[in-house]
Interface confidence: low
Amino acid sequence: TGTTDVIVAYNLTWKSTNFKTILEWEPKPINYVYTVQISPRLGDWKNKCFHTTDTECDVTDEIMRNVKETYVARVLSYPADTVLTAQEPPFTNSPPFTPYLDTNLGQPVIQSFEQVGTKLNVTVEAARTLVRVNGTFLRLRDVFGKDLNYTLYYWRASSTGKKKATTNTNEFLIDVDKGENYCFSVQAVIPSRRVNQKSPESRIECTSQEKAVSRETGHHHHHH
């Protein structure tokens, strides 16, 4: 195989969770390299992952400029010993990607919980994103606002019948039976989306009259 033989990239796929966004493709290159370009408008291309032998490229910094914009990337194939020429190398375009609509919601973490009498209070950790404004990072709630809901699935520890509660904050306060232990998990939901509406469910936590151990953090939570 000559060094000028290149294969056009295929299976271009966006992998994105809480706005951390990576473009993946195939195949592994032999004697050639890839350059990724990304643009919110076809033709105004920005180079990323220049002359790489990887088959993935982190484009988070670029898509963060405007998470409601629609982006297209393309993967260009160059011979490994290439010199820059005016000739355009072969390339493949990605599917369009709109971060605000298309990024997957990450698994939520239950920050804390407490059962007092007939009330169960559950707080979801305010997940940070990689959306950066002036060098600092926004929380999921800051980006999605009221579009972001959380669903709490809860059930008596002694039974399997699940109940459901929803909030557009990061806190739940629900009525439970006094003296009963409860188990629960949470899920992030964006109801206005057509796809990628729901996150994976969080780890399950359970209350106890003395204490419960969070499997997420390994720390002890004390309860009444």
Epitope: S112, T123, R132, T136, D142, H221
Partner: antibody, heavy 124, light 108 residues
């Protein structure tokens, strides 16, 4: 270097509305969270609430029904309003910048810039 | 609400001595969101430690933070005259963000 300058009425009667403003000099409102904290005479610090870069707000539930925090990006200012004040609202009120910081895979969150404080007294 | 309990309320020490301040949370707190502040009379609080362990810009290395879960500690290895002040811990992980009641470090 970012500095916060705050001002507002220092003496109020019960049932009036406390109104304070904090101006950001040497930096932008964008990308940070902006908090109000108060400290009653001889006591500790109490977080009142914050406004985020996107305009989203979070309030202390104990004050939520009376508090409004707003932002004016054109003036690089944010403001606190606390309605129906009583003597229990007498305190030094501070504005502060909350900085979320990402480093080596972890997030940190802290108040790194503070105003000098405004003494507010509620008395009939 | 996460309650932060600081102890002791007052610490009477001499310059050059070691100060150990405790902050205990009513529920587990992510160390990423635990900070320590110093406050002197008539002044605003000043950030000392963030992320439970990291010194803020310009803070001398005699200040150090440690701990995790529900128990956190601020240590001043050798007290300087300017270190006599009130120290507060704060959690910023769960709304409402809360401060401890403070520990006053005074000259013995």
């Amino acid at each position: 270097q970012v500095q916060l300058q705050q001002w507002g009425a220092g003496l109020l009667k019960p049932s009036e509305t406390l109104s304070l403003t904090c101006a950001v000099y040497g930096g932008s409102l964008s990308g940070y969270y902006w908090s109000w904290i108060r400290q009653p005479p001889g006591k500790g610090l109490e977080w009142i609430g914050e406004i985020g870069a996107s305009g989203s707000t979070r309030y202390n539930p104990s004050l939520k029904s009376r508090v409004t925090i707003s932002v004016d990006t054109s003036k690089n200012q944010f403001s606190l309003k606390l309605s129906s004040v009583t003597a229990a609202d007498t305190a030094v009120y501070y504005c502060a910048r909350d900085t979320p910081y990402y480093y080596e895979g972890g997030y940190y969150y802290y108040m790194d810039v503070w105003g000098k404080g405004t003494t507010v007294t509620v008395s009939s | 609400e996460i309650v932060l309990t600081q102890s002791p309320g007052t610490l009477s020490l001499s310059p050059g001595e070691r100060a150990t301040l405790s902050c205990r949370a009513s529920q587990s707190v992510s160390s990423s969101f635990l900070a320590w502040y110093q406050q002197k009379p008539g002044q605003a609080p000043r950030l000392l430690i963030y992320g439970a362990y990291s010194r803020a810009t310009g803070i001398p290395d005699r200040f150090s933070g440690s701990g995790s879960g529900t128990d956190f500690t601020l240590t001043i290895s050798r007290l300087e005259p300017e270190d006599f002040a009130v120290y507060y811990c704060q959690q910023a992980g769960v709304v409402p963000y809360t401060f401890g009641g403070g520990t006053k470090v005074e000259i013995k």
